[in-house]
């Protein structure tokens, strides 16, 4: 008997209000045996996946896309998916992302690696199959 | 019963390539990230590289570019571009559980000798 | 590059004794770390996964602990059963780091 799985988390760091210009961290977060995370945005009309999958703790595994800088385009909602073979998780609910003008330039500098995950997809309609594969691989290109 | 198996494991003679394959039951092996992981006579487990589901690969440090891997939708490949006797073991395919779990479905193994 | 080192490289004990084997890392691999044990002519057997988890049909003399760069796995009563070869493997294999196994363990049983 398959196993059900748990709903994922989303977080972003350092927050979910951001200057523009200013860098983002969306983190996702699942149980063990998590292979690839997906963050989605607005209704899964754009998404990303990543294979670069931590276990952060004996019981919680995590992902994290980085928006290196952030622009007003940025602005919206995000959610997380994950794939734990053979089957796609739930989303997690939506997290809201606003961006505000800074009245300086961009704010300190990066205090966090980061990994990053490869360049924005349009889904095909089985994109949560639950025998739908990754849909790509690592790359060291920026969310967005 | 979900399993794998590895194929190919022969003596050859140095500089000759040899390709190893890896075969599933009871599973779509296609899903999956797959690692190979190589046992010296009487050493201890030395992990070569990882293919993972979207085909993009890990090596070992020590191992790049003396091993490829690669998949088709049904097996996963080793190659050992040319071998020398340092290359004699047991080869294991595994499949990689996911994120804490690690290469931990494993098949028998094959022998390969490698000798002039 | 990660490197994983296992200690010690041999141990003999009795029957109903423990055994400790520790698992240090080069740098910090967060939870990413399992435990196998081999037989001879046998492929290994998963043990413990993502640090203190008992694999399915592991009994609970087996338990895995730590965190960051130090592991430990402790093998309570000791059985017969339990003569093998033992080995930690860093299960990350992203873009940070790329993980792999401790020189292994040999567990003898007096």
């Known amino acids: 008997q398959e196993e059900d799985l748990p709903r994922p988390s989303i977080s972003a760091e350092p927050g979910t209000v951001i200057p523009l210009g200013s860098h983002v961290t969306f983190v996702c977060r699942g149980p063990v045996g998590v292979q690839t995370f997906r963050l989605e945005r607005d209704s899964r009309s754009t998404y990303n996946d990543t294979e670069d999958v931590s276990q952060a703790s004996p019981s919680e595994s995590e992902a994290r896309f980085r928006i290196d800088s952030v622009r007003e385009g940025n602005a919206g909602l995000y959610r997380c998916i994950y794939y734990k073979p053979p089957k796609w998780s739930e989303q997690s609910d939506y997290l809201e992302l606003l961006v505000k003008e800074s009245s300086g330039g961009p704010d300190s500098p990066d205090t966090e690696p980061g990994s990053s995950a490869g360049p924005t997809q349009r889904p095909s309609d089985n994109s949560h199959n639950e025998h739908a594969p990754a849909s790509q691989g690592l790359k060291a290109e920026h969310l967005y | 019963e979900q399993s794998v198996e590895e194929s190919g494991g022969r003596l050859v003679t140095p500089g000759t390539p040899l390709t190893l394959t890896c075969t599933a039951s009871?599973?779509?092996?296609?899903?999956?990230?797959m690692c190979w992981v190589r046992q010296a006579p009487g050493k201890g487990l030395e992990w070569i590289g990882l293919?993972?589901?979207?085909?993009s690969t890990a090596y070992a440090s020590w191992a790049n570019g003396r091993f490829t891997i690669s998949r088709t939708s049904t097996t996963v490949d080793l190659k050992i571009t040319s071998p020398t006797s340092e290359d004699t073991a047991t080869y294991f395919c595994?499949?990689?559980?996911?994120?804490?779990?690690?290469?931990?479905?494993w098949g028998p193994g094959t022998l390969v000798t490698i000798s002039s | 590059e990660l490197v994983l080192t296992q200690t010690p490289a041999s141990v003999s004990e009795p029957v109903g004794g423990t055994v400790t084997i520790k698992c240090q890392a080069s740098?910090?691999?967060?939870?990413?770390l399992a435990w196998y044990q081999q037989k001879p002519g046998q492929p290994p057997k998963q043990l413990i996964y993502?640090?203190?988890n008992l694999a399915s049909g592991v009994p609970s003399r087996f338990k895995g602990s730590g965190s960051g760069t130090e592991f430990t796995l402790t093998i309570s009563d000791l059985e017969c059963a339990d003569a093998a070869s033992y080995y930690c493997?860093?299960?990350?294999?992203?873009?940070?780091?790329?993980?792999?196994f401790g020189g292994g363990t040999e567990v003898e049983i007096k």
């Open positions: 493997e860093c299960t990350y294999y992203g873009n940070s780091y790329v993980g792999g």
């Open positions: 293919i993972r589901a979207s085909h």
């Open positions: 740098q910090s691999i967060d939870s990413n």
């Open positions: 595994a499949r990689y559980g996911g994120s804490g779990i690690g290469c931990n479905l």
């Open positions: 009871g599973f779509t092996i296609s899903d999956y990230h």
């Open positions: 993502a640090v203190s």
